[in-house]
């Protein structure tokens, strides 16, 4: 038998993926475990094998269909179980009634690009990936810019309280290398959390023109 504290956390990406992490103190690394999804109003069940990500935690993705297919709605409830093999039997280690649209975490924004760059300004755009049409415009974004000599953790957060897939960064230093990241969150859902940060976009401001009156 496995003793210790257990934590089972899952998020829905709003389309066709439920990502789960199961943590269990004192669990055996080589035990075979599965996450089993049993929707209350769908004709499919889905499993994924939990793979170790650290000494006491495992993760897997329940892939419900093609990436942009809308597999669940706001009224769905999915019973999620962690089952681990004990000899010839399978033991339920954790269970939850999962409401997908109360537990959202979208994919990181993609396709970041510099639209226009000047000496002190840079206009950047991005796209959201695999986000449900149900949200319409009910999304918000956070962005951050990495300046030379600083860390991402020190970068101030810029909040966009609407579905705005671009930003104009101001008061930048000429001829300087920067990096930029953005993340997204739906307004819906009691346990909804921010997406991962996007891949960083590197850009350089233009040098100041020489011999010009300011």
């Amino acid at each position: 038998a496995v003793n210790g504290t257990s934590q089972f956390t899952c998020f829905y990406n709003s389309r066709a993926n439920i990502s789960c992490v199961w943590s269990q103190d004192g669990a055996l690394q080589d035990t075979s475990c599965q996450v089993h999804a049993w929707p209350d109003r769908r004709r499919w069940n889905q499993t994924c094998e939990l793979l170790p990500v650290s000494q006491a935690s495992w993760a897997c993705n329940l892939i419900l269909g093609a990436p942009d297919s809308q597999k669940l709605t706001t009224v769905d409830i999915v019973t999620l179980r962690v089952l681990c093999r004990e000899g010839v039997r399978w033991r339920v280690m954790a269970i939850q009634d999962f409401k997908p649209f109360e537990n959202l975490r979208l994919m990181a924004p993609i396709s970041l690009q510099v639209v226009h760059v000047e000496t002190h300004r840079c206009n950047i755009s991005w796209e959201i990936s695999q986000a449900s049409h149900y949200f319409e415009r009910h999304l918000e974004f956070e962005a951050r810019t990495l300046s030379p000599g600083h860390t991402w953790e020190e970068a101030p957060l810029l909040t966009l309280k609407q579905k705005q897939e671009w930003i104009c960064l101001e008061t930048l230093t000429p001829d300087t290398q920067y990096e930029f990241q953005v993340r997204v969150k739906p307004l819906q859902g009691e346990f909804t959390t921010w997406s991962p940060w996007s891949q960083p976009l590197a850009f350089r401001t233009k040098p100041a023109a020489l011999g010009k009156d300011t």
């Epitope: 075979s32 599965q34 089993h36 499919w44 069940n45 499993t47 094998e49």
Partner: nanobody, 123 residues
């Protein structure tokens, strides 16, 4: 709808080897737990081997343990069955099966199936 197509069967002498392949199309391959079954003439279709969605865990019927190896290549949407030290009693039609539910795949009812490939082992 998911489609499965087996290949690699044939006639082989006892003690020989064959490698079966099953290509999956029509859906996201990594959703599926994959299995091999076989059906000898006049017998029920029987479970041979299973591989989980990640490929990490495999299981076998006792009669093939140590001789058969199931594996998958998620980049190629393909599952394999490497059969070594074949015996006449391995003669059967071998079927590839797919199910999104690991816990249902051994019961034949809800699986997606290929057409099968004939394996004949002569003594």
């Amino acid at each position: 709808q998911v489609q499965l197509q087996e290949s690699g069967g044939g006639l082989v002498q006892a003690g020989g080897s064959l490698r079966l392949s099953c290509v999956v199309s029509g859906d996201v391959f990594v959703r599926y737990t994959m299995a091999w079954f076989r059906q000898a003439p006049g017998k029920e279709r029987e479970f041979v081997a299973v591989v989980t969605d990640s490929g990490r865990t495999t299981e076998y019927v006792d009669s093939v343990k140590g001789r058969f190896t199931v594996s998958r290549d998620n980049a190629k949407n393909t599952v394999y069955l490497q059969m070594n030290n074949l015996k006449p009693e391995d003669t059967a039609v071998y079927y590839c099966a797919a199910n999104t539910d690991y816990f249902q795949i051994r019961s034949v009812d809800n699986n997606a199936w290929g057409q099968g490939t004939q394996v004949t082992v002569s003594s």
